[in-house]
């Protein structure tokens, strides 16, 4: 009987010899559940598992807790890989997180965290980050220490208000905090003075809604 080869992340895919960008099927060890993820095999040495992408507003990111848990969208376009998969993956070994951002004037920037993981669902997929470098701000636009994940139907932020309902999208809101990469997508010339847009405060300020974002992870020892 032929042995089925499975990959837990895009780093494993890359090391197996598949060095072309594209959508691959990933499976966690000791699991039969598969997810489809986009693998970036070119940027910074390749092996990056894309866990979020915004590029054109084609996908609605104002989703429920369950949808953010299991993932949604199109791995070739705009999507969210899924909190449960990312939580399990990032608790099995050490991962780095790179967030790549594009504005509407042709500029690009990134934030790189040397250690990233999500707590389990029991702790509302709380985000843990350490060691920020990059060009998208000297201060982390994801509040530190990390917050619990909130969605329109799960208010786990640190505001008396409901950040996810107010700003739209699921995110690790503080009260409500300096970022939200899952906010409303605003087209060019409608992207300024928007409180509920795609925000990364320490790069573009509070009212600027970005053109594109990619969140990607890779094992720290890649």
């Amino acid at each position: 009987k032929e042995e089925q080869i499975s990959f837990r992340d895009c780093a494993e895919v890359f090391k197996s010899g598949h060095t072309t960008n594209g959508v691959y099927t990933l499976t966690l060890p000791n699991s039969t559940e598969e997810v489809k993820a986009y693998c970036d095999m070119e940027a910074g040495g390749g092996g990056w598992t894309i866990i979020q992408r915004r590029e054109d507003g084609s996908v609605d990111f104002q989703r429920t807790w369950k949808e953010y848990k299991v993932g949604f969208g199109n791995p070739s376009g705009e999507y969210w890989l899924g909190n449960e998969f990312v939580s399990q993956l990032t608790n099995q070994q050490r991962y780095v997180l790179k967030i790549h951002l594009k504005d509407w004037e042709g500029n690009e920037a990134y934030s790189l965290y040397e250690h990233f993981y999500l707590s389990s669902e029991e702790l509302n997929y709380r985000i843990h980050l350490k060691g920020l470098t990059g060009t998208a701000g000297k201060i982390s636009s994801i509040s530190q220490p990390g917050n619990d994940f909130s969605t329109k139907d799960a208010d786990n932020d640190k505001c008396i208000c409901k950040c996810s309902q107010m700003l739209t999208g699921g995110w690790w809101f503080d009260a409500c905090g300096p970022s939200n990469l899952n906010g409303m997508y605003y087209p060019q010339r409608q992207n300024t003075n928007k409180f509920n847009g795609i925000k990364w405060y320490y790069w573009k300020g509070s009212g600027y809604s970005l053109k594109g974002t990619t969140m990607m992870i890779r094992p720290a020892d890649f």
Partner: nanobody
Framework: EVQLVESGGGLVQPGESLRLSCVAS????????????MYWYRQAPGKERELVAI????????TYADSVKGRFTISRDNAKNTMFLQMNSLKPEDTAVYVC?????????WGQGTQVTVSS
């Protein structure tokens, strides 16, 4: 199932103080009280439940409703699995049932509440 038990309520006159406690138990294996963000709510007769204060799992970050800011202080003792609400300069409009809450995996666990009545 997590159990939350409030105490410390009572009848006081305007301007007086009370200290509420909420003791938590029954967290799943591998988790402790210190892992969880906690909340105090209140519900007055005929009114909607109101979020009063939030405290982060480490106790360092606190948020208050405008109506209680400067008068109420939320705190916690993680070694004793207990959260507190120190209420000073109480007003008649603070009269309500005060309930503690924890949110886990998109579900809420609630205590039974403790009655606070502010009246002269």
């Amino acid at each position: 199932e997590v159990q939350l038990v409030e105490s410390g309520g009572g009848l006081v006159q305007p301007g007086e103080s009370l200290r509420l406690s909420c003791v938590a138990s029954g967290f799943p294996s591998g988790f402790t009280f210190s892992d969880y963000q906690m909340y105090w709510y209140r519900q007055a007769p005929g009114k909607e439940r109101e979020l009063v204060a939030i405290i982060s799992n480490d106790g360092l970050r606190k948020t208050y409703a405008d109506s209680v800011k400067g008068r109420f202080t939320i705190s916690r003792d993680n070694a004793k699995n207990t959260m507190f609400l120190q209420m000073n300069s109480l007003k008649p409009e603070d009269t309500a049932v005060y309930v503690c809450n924890v949110r886990r995996a998109n579900r809420d666990d609630w205590g039974q509440g403790t009655q606070v009545t502010v009246s002269s």
